[in-house]
């Protein structure tokens, strides 16, 4: 063991370092000192530090831990929360302009049915905004008020347009016989089923990446123990007591020292690891009917079809309502009047051609890529931490939080410690309540995330076989029934292109009537202009 | 004919709470959406909350969320509106009313004091 | 309020009289509007609906219109029983809820 070179004879070197560390000098001794009441920094001979500089050195190395931990998780944290601001806005963007493809589809096929129509889109589509940012919204729910309000409508300007204006007399006798009659078939179940699974998704994957800037945020603005903090001490500042100015803590006392301090965090570990496996199987499944881009720009089509339905079935539907809401007060006689052989085309879908350019689904999978490099991120933040403070090269000639030495051995400070604190004790410890929440939080989103992503969640409820549509007419390659129909087959473009909406947003949103609101052509959508180049840390 | 009869108003403390009810009758409940709206004396209207007509979704206004709840019985045709943590200012006439985006049938109110 | 009425309008017996409603893209000018009139003591009540139509037992008197993000009702024939309180109402997309202009008090002079 080398002995320790000779001590500042006045502390000069100390006082100058302290003084940057708190301005005044009253506290720092001229001439090293016994040093006997010092707690942390035990002295092996004179020292220049007192007490209260051991307690500021404790507080600094608390602080600088901290900020050592939130520069660590700068990367990832910058990476979610981007991405999370992205995909909502996103998400809107989609929301918005399925709504205006079906406030288009009804002006441009059903004008007599505006504004009526556009308000229960609206409605509808309001709905679909608040349920995919984890309101209490059920979709069943929605979707019936769609077509409880549509029937109404449809029935008193398509249907029957010689009834007067003042049909609200007899709207509630129309919205009973809607279910009771199933007027639009099956469609309403379609697209309960189609929308309900994909903003499912949609919403777990938005709650998913919230709790991740949760969980960094939490672990972010940890508050480190005193026994951590004397231990920080001891590695990063006990050295300059003996006025060892600079000399680095060994990189292997380093590592024990952080293991110990972390230990509480490094137990999100396990659970961080099955987040982002478990986020990358939802968005594995995100496509055909899991995938809200898919599903709500090909709504307005279904919709279409559904009043197509209705016109179809138009002659034996009018003379059942006839009778049935002749005096909408006697709706007890309802069920007398269910019509025997309403049509019902069988092959009522036909699917669209999607072209997949840059897609919401692709940013997805970027995502995940970049998030599985930090998939050991908790497990290796001791590691990273020692490597991204000063420690000695190779444990050669360092501080082992007691002396210099010329080669670290863990053992011997091991055994150096055991007289100030036990490091297995804290180890022991446990979590902090905090990392506690977080653990019991990301157990529950992994839960959801894996009931999510079960394979038999992903076949399409078989009970639609059940309703009317043959087997086969929305089979797996069909994109679940998805798409356009008949004469008007739809070819959605680009299926959103949505970084550059980011950018610039349509001003066609939300203005039935306006003249440059977008609409759905005969043949074809041309989603949206591209503006090529825009600046994305997802790029 | 469509009837909305509100009941359980009263005077009540700040930081108490209280129970609107309100029977319906003449239509059926369960298809629609449902809402409470109030009007503070002298005041306009102030739409409260909403349910749906399943009572699977619910909506609040910014004001008094958190500390009302909305809810339903289909079998019993009433819906109601728990209050709590009321304030001074929620002292209004509380309206239910048939609808979610507009209203086409009221009730009569009921009168919700809010003092020391 | 998010939507302006003006708070009084008034005129003789068999006059026209209109009630303006004005608002914003994200209210008005992205959905319907309703009009209620509500009597002093008494509960509103349903005057127009989807910018204008009327529910059956409301006379012809009254007829709404909408123009971009703006809105009226007017009053034809003004009788003195139509002393009211009226409300205009919309939906609010940025705010997810229904809105209500301030209400105009209609007097019949």
């Known amino acids: 063991q080398p002995p320790p070179p000779p001590p500042d004879a006045t502390c000069h070197q100390v006082r100058s370092f302290f003084q940057r560390l708190q301005p005044g000098l009253k506290w720092v001794p001229e001439t090293p000192v016994p040093g006997s009441d010092l707690q942390v920094c035990l002295p092996k001979g004179p020292t220049c530090c007192s007490r209260k500089m051991e307690e500021k050195y404790q507080l600094t190395a608390r602080l600088n831990m901290e900020q050592l931990l939130q520069s660590a998780s700068m990367e990832l944290k910058f990476l979610i929360i981007q991405n999370a601001a992205v995909f909502q806005e996103a998400f809107e963007i989609v929301v918005r302009h399925a709504k205006n493809y079906t406030n288009a589809m009804f002006k441009n096929n059903y004008p007599s049915l505006t504004p009526q129509a556009f308000e229960f889109v609206g409605e509808f589509f309001t709905d679909v905004s608040l349920y995919i940012l984890g309101s209490d919204i059920n979709v069943d729910d929605m979707v019936n008020e769609l077509f409880d309000s549509l029937f109404p409508v449809i029935y008193t300007q398509l249907m029957n347009p010689g009834l007067p204006d003042s049909a609200l007399d007899i709207n509630e006798c129309l919205r009973g016989a809607r279910r009771d009659l199933k007027v639009f078939g099956n469609f309403p179940k379609l697209i309960m089923t189609q929308v309900s699974k994909s903003l499912q998704v949609t919403r777990i994957f938005l709650q998913a990446l919230n709790l991740g800037i949760e969980v960094i945020n939490t672990t972010d603005h940890l508050k480190f123990s005193k026994d951590c903090g004397r231990m920080l001490t001891r590695m990063w500042y006990c050295s300059y007591c003996q006025g060892l100015m600079m000399v680095k803590p060994c990189g292997g006392y380093c590592n024990v020292v952080m293991q110990g301090c972390m230990a509480g965090v490094v137990e999100i570990d396990k659970y961080w690891r099955e987040y982002i496996l478990s986020l990358e199987e939802l968005v594995n499944g995100m496509y055909r009917i899991y995938d809200m881009e898919n599903v709500l720009l090909g709504l307005f089509s279904t919709i279409h079809d559904s009043i197509q339905y209705v016109q179809k079935n138009a002659g034996k539907l009018t003379t059942t309502i006839g009778k049935l809401c002749a005096h909408s007060q006697q709706r007890q006689y309802r069920s007398a009047y269910y019509p025997e052989d309403l049509f019902i085309d069988k092959k009522v879908l036909k699917v669209a051609h999607v072209e997949h350019e840059e897609t919401l689904s692709s940013r997805r999978r970027e995502l995940i890529q970049k998030l599985k490099s930090f998939i050991s991120f908790y497990s290796a933040l001791p590691g990273y931490i020692c490597s991204h403070s000063p420690v000695a090269e190779n444990d050669t000639l360092c501080w082992n939080g007691q002396e210099l030495v010329e080669r670290y051995s863990q053992k011997a400070a091991r055994n150096g410690m055991k007289n100030q604190f036990n490091l297995h004790e804290l180890k022991m410890k446990g979590p902090e309540p905090v990392v506690s929440q977080i653990i019991d939080k990301l157990k529950h989103i992994n839960q959801l995330l894996r009931t999510m992503s079960m394979p038999k969640g992903r076949v399409l409820d078989k009970n639609l076989d059940e309703e009317g549509f043959e087997s086969g007419d929305c089979g797996d390659d069909e994109d679940e029934c998805i798409g356009g129909s008949g004469d008007g087959m739809i070819k959605v473009k680009n299926q959103l292109r949505f970084l550059a909406e980011l950018a610039y947003d349509l001003d066609v949103d939300d203005a039935p009537g306006n003249s440059q609101q977008a609409t759905p052509k005969d043949n074809e959508i041309s989603t949206f202009h591209n503006l090529g180049n825009v600046h994305s840390p997802l790029k | 004919e469509v009837q909305l009869l509100e009941s359980g108003g009263g005077l009540v403390q700040p930081g108490g709470s209280l129970r609107l009810s309100c029977a319906a009758s003449g239509f059926t409940f369960s298809s629609y959406a449902m809402s409470w709206v109030r009007q503070a004396p002298g005041k306009g209207l102030e739409w409260v909350s909403a349910i749906s007509g399943s009572g699977g979704s619910t909506y609040y206004a910014d004001s008094v969320k958190g500390r009302f709840t909305i809810s339903r019985d289909n079998s019993k045709n009433t819906l109601y509106l728990q209050m709590n943590s009321l304030r001074a200012e929620d002292t209004a006439v509380y309206y239910c009313a048939r609808g979610k985006r507009y209203f086409d049938y009221w009730g009569q109110g009921t009168m919700v004091t809010v003092s020391s | 309020y998010e939507l302006t009425q003006p708070p009084s309008a008034s005129g003789t017996p068999g006059q026209r009289v209109t009630i303006s409603c004005s608002g914003g893209s994200s209210n008005i000018g992205s959905n319907t509007v309703n009009w209620f009139r509500q009597l002093p003591g008494t509960a509103p009540k349903l005057l127009v609906y989807f910018n204008n139509q009327r529910p059956s037992g409301v006379p012809d008197r009254f007829s709404g219109s909408k123009s971009g993000t703006s809105a009226s009702l007017a009053i034809g024939g003004l009788q003195s029983d139509d002393e009211a309180d009226y409300y205009c109402?919309?939906?609010?997309?940025?705010?997810?809820?229904?809105?209500f202009g301030g209400g105009t008090k209609v007097t019949v002079l």
């Open positions: 109402v919309a939906w609010d997309d940025s705010l997810n809820a229904p809105v």
